[in-house]
């Protein structure tokens, strides 16, 4: 690696992957092992992130970019840049301080993460429950009760295609 120096603005001359060494008359020196600088003109390099324990390496550290981590199977990322790993639960459960717990009646969770959410209240939209909710699935709302009078179909057929100048049959 060629150590470089600029007379006018020594540090701005140092590219990513190097640091501008105050102690060496501001020459550009390569980042030491397990460190990186993602921008030019840095006085020091930063220490590479280490993906340990429940974290696993998604992208290795290089002299110009930090390592990126994700989570081992059974865990999922939380926070910016996967700063934390949280335990997965099954669908129909949520993570509490005491571990994974089933969703209470009237709530559901269709993912391995997050909290149990209340079933949709179909009546608020003037609709009825078409399919009951479970711990893993939300209710499915159908047409309003008035639409379900005798003889009425619970599924509305598609409207026939109309051409300009023709009234519906």
């Amino acid at each position: 690696f060629e150590r470089t120096r600029s007379l006018q603005d020594p540090c701005s001359n140092c590219p990513a992957g190097t640091f501008c060494d105050n102690n060496r008359n501001q020459i550009c020196s390569p980042c030491p092992p397990n460190s990186f600088s993602s921008a030019g003109g840095q006085r020091t390099c930063d220490i590479c992130r280490q993906c340990k324990g429940v974290f696993r390496t998604r992208k290795e550290c290089s002299s110009t970019s930090n390592a990126e981590c994700d989570c081992t199977p059974g865990f999922h990322c939380l926070g910016a840049g996967c700063s934390m790993c949280e335990q997965d639960c099954k669908q129909g459960q949520e993570l509490t301080k005491k571990g994974c717990k089933d969703c209470c009646f009237g709530t559901f969770n269709d993912q391995k993460r997050g909290i149990c959410r209340p079933w949709t209240n179909c009546s608020l939209d003037g609709k009825s429950v078409l399919v009951n909710g479970t711990k893993e699935r939300d209710v499915v709302c159908g047409p309003s009760p008035a639409d379900l009078s005798p003889g009425a179909s619970s599924v509305t057929p598609p409207a026939p295609a109309r051409e300009p100048g023709h009234s519906p049959q």
């Epitope: 060494d21 105050n22 102690n23 020196s29 980042c31 006085r43 020091t44 390099c45």
Partner: antibody, heavy 123, light 107 residues
Framework: QVQLQQPGAELVRPGASVKLSCKAS????????INWVKQRPGQGLEWIGN????????NYNQKFKDKATLTVDKSSNTVYMQLNSPTSEDSAVYYC????????????????WGQGTSVTVSS | DIQMTQTTSALSASLGDRVTIGCRAS??????LYWYQQKPDGTVKLLIY???RLHSGVPSRFSGSGSGTDYSLTIRNLEQEDVATYFC?????????FGGGTKLEIK
């Protein structure tokens, strides 16, 4: 563990140069910068200069360019600072310190400090 | 040379208090700011490096923050052993320079 050993006190005659020592242990001596810092009684801290033991590269604060001379003895893991033509203004505690690892975020921080040598310039 | 200013030269606080000590630089330091603790017996220790990173062995009651020219050291749950003088130092460019120090006492 990292240690920087300095003598507790030195009494110096005005005009008679004195050489302060700083013996390092507990780490790879040649791989870290050693600084010298001055503190007058009841005052703040002043950086005098530093030296890299591996190749004896030095930097000096312009204010101390003619006052201090930094040298190293690799065989004994010791750094020296000679105070030239001392006057009463040079009566102070002198600390040697060690920088962090080259290139890392704490590189220019003084990670470890000696106990300091109290220098009294008096006839 | 970069001038480092600690406007408060002395402050007094009670045990358990939260204390903040400020430091201002005459130019942008790009976070190359360090904090030291000097005990009454003269012993000096590095507390914080690169603005906010805790040096090994330093209690988590100490924290640092700031950017550009303005930086601060915060001590939570003040303890008797925190009685000391606190100095900031810039490592942005030579010569390294220190603030004048802030002497912390217990009420």
């Amino acid at each position: 563990q990292v240690q920087l050993q300095q003598p507790g006190a030195e009494l110096v005659r005005p005009g008679a140069s004195v050489k302060l020592s700083c013996k390092a242990s507990g780490y790879t001596f040649t791989s870290y910068w050693i600084n010298w810092v001055k503190q007058r009684p009841g005052q703040g801290l002043e950086w005098i200069g530093n030296i890299y033991p591996s190749d004896s590269y030095t930097n000096y604060n312009q204010k101390f360019k003619d006052k201090a001379t930094l040298t190293v003895d690799k065989s004994s893991n010791t750094v020296y600072m000679q105070l030239n033509s001392p006057t009463s203004e040079d009566s102070a505690v002198y600390y040697c310190t060690r920088n962090g690892v080259e290139g890392y975020p704490h590189y220019y921080a003084m990670e470890y400090w000696g106990q300091g040598t109290s220098v009294t310039v008096s006839s | 040379d970069i001038q480092m200013t600690q406007t408060t030269s002395a402050l007094s606080a009670s045990l358990g208090d939260r204390v903040t000590i400020g430091c201002r630089a005459s130019q942008d330091l790009s976070n190359h700011l360090y904090w030291y603790q000097q005990k009454p017996d003269g012993t000096v220790k590095l507390l914080i490096y690169y603005t906010s990173r805790l040096h090994s062995g330093v209690p988590s009651r100490f924290s640092g923050s700031g950017s550009g020219t303005d930086y601060s050291l915060t001590i939570r749950n003040l303890e008797q052993e925190d009685v000391a003088t606190y100095f900031c130092q810039q490592g942005y460019t030579l010569p390294y320079t220190f603030g004048g120090g802030t002497k912390l006492e217990i009420k």
